[in-house]
Amino acid sequence: KAMHVAQPAVVLASSRGIASFVCEYASPGKATEVRVTVLRQADSQVTEVCAATYMMGNELTFLDDSICTGTSSGNQVNLTIQGLRAMDTGLYICKVELMYPPPYYLGIGNGTQIYVIDPEPCPDSD
């Protein structure tokens, strides 16, 4: 009873530094509480970008100071990361945990490579 997590291979952030992608999981059980975490992998280092726990049927709520927002629909989570800059280009992994009721299940996506290109500064006008 493995939990498979699917996410797009590549996403290009907008000129305003916003990237959105869908994280979909195949739930092996009837979970009522799900935790979704976005991780960034650079070299061998993995860091947490943001995380949210939600009750099935309810909205996904990230902390106020989070750079992530999202909505959930069934076994699908629509994630948006904002405030991205060129230096944030990298592999963003969607991790899904079925927290309640037991048993616990872990699912980790293969990652979405997000490319961020800083916009060219506007030329000065006379």
Partner: antibody, heavy 118, light 106 residues
């Protein structure tokens, strides 16, 4: 650097209680699941319990369910294991371990020995 | 509960030789790790996700496999590699370990 230091082990009589502590440093404690794993003398590793993130979710091995309670204090970066109704078969070295972002137990404490004997 | 069975129980080899350790699961496993434990010490993570080396682990250690059959290979045994090795599944609760394989000096 990440550090986990267990304490609270010792010799205790069957039926009595003991509380283990695990002091964590070098990482954001509340962002990780924290586990207790034990190892009886000369035996293999046995997972005991886990507490998740904000402490709202806890899971236990069947062998300790109803007798052991895992808890944490995020303000003190400390993990606890309250062990009640101890039995001889609970004799083991108890390790705390961090559940890494990708799920495996990436850091372990040095362990604390609990001996249950009359 | 997923039961992990390691084989052999003991592996007697000389430094420089290749070690192949097996871990078989009672049902399909999504996430598998390998740990090394030396006497009087805590376990140390070697491999996670069946084949990814943990930080600071030498490249003589490699993991492979999927489903129910997994392998840890040590390409050339160094004196410090003689220890007990455990596999663990962490994709679902309860988290379970194999009984261990002891790699000893021949």
């Amino acid at each position: 650097q990440v550090q986990l230091v267990e304490s609270g082990g010792g010799v205790v009589q069957p039926g009595r209680s003991l509380r283990l502590s695990c002091a964590a440093s070098g990482f954001t404690f509340s962002s990780y699941g924290m586990h207790w794993v034990r190892q009886a003398p000369g035996k293999g590793l046995e997972w005991v319990a886990v507490i998740w993130y904000d402490g709202s979710n806890k899971f236990y091995a069947d062998s300790v369910k109803g007798r052991f309670t895992i808890s944490s204090d995020n303000s003190k970066n400390t993990l606890y294991l309250q062990m009640n109704s101890l039995r001889a078969e609970d004799t083991a070295v108890y390790y705390c371990a961090r559940g890494g972002h990708l799920g495996s137990f990436d850091y372990w404490g040095q362990g604390t020995l609990v001996t249950v004997s009359s | 509960e997923i039961v992990l069975t390691q084989s052999p129980g003991t592996l007697s080899l000389s430094p420089g030789e290749r070690a192949t350790l097996s871990c078989r699961a009672s049902q399909s496993v999504s996430y598998l790790a390998w740990y090394q434990q030396k006497p009087g010490q805590a376990p140390r993570l070697l491999i996670y996700g069946a084949s990814s080396r943990a930080t600071g682990i030498p490249d003589r250690f490699s993991g492979s496999g999927s489903g129910t059959d997994f392998t840890l290979t040590i390409s050339r045994l160094e004196p410090e590699d003689f220890a007990v090795y455990y596999c663990q599944q962490y994709g679902s609760s309860p988290w379970t370990f194999g009984q261990g394989t002891k790699v000893e000096i021949k």
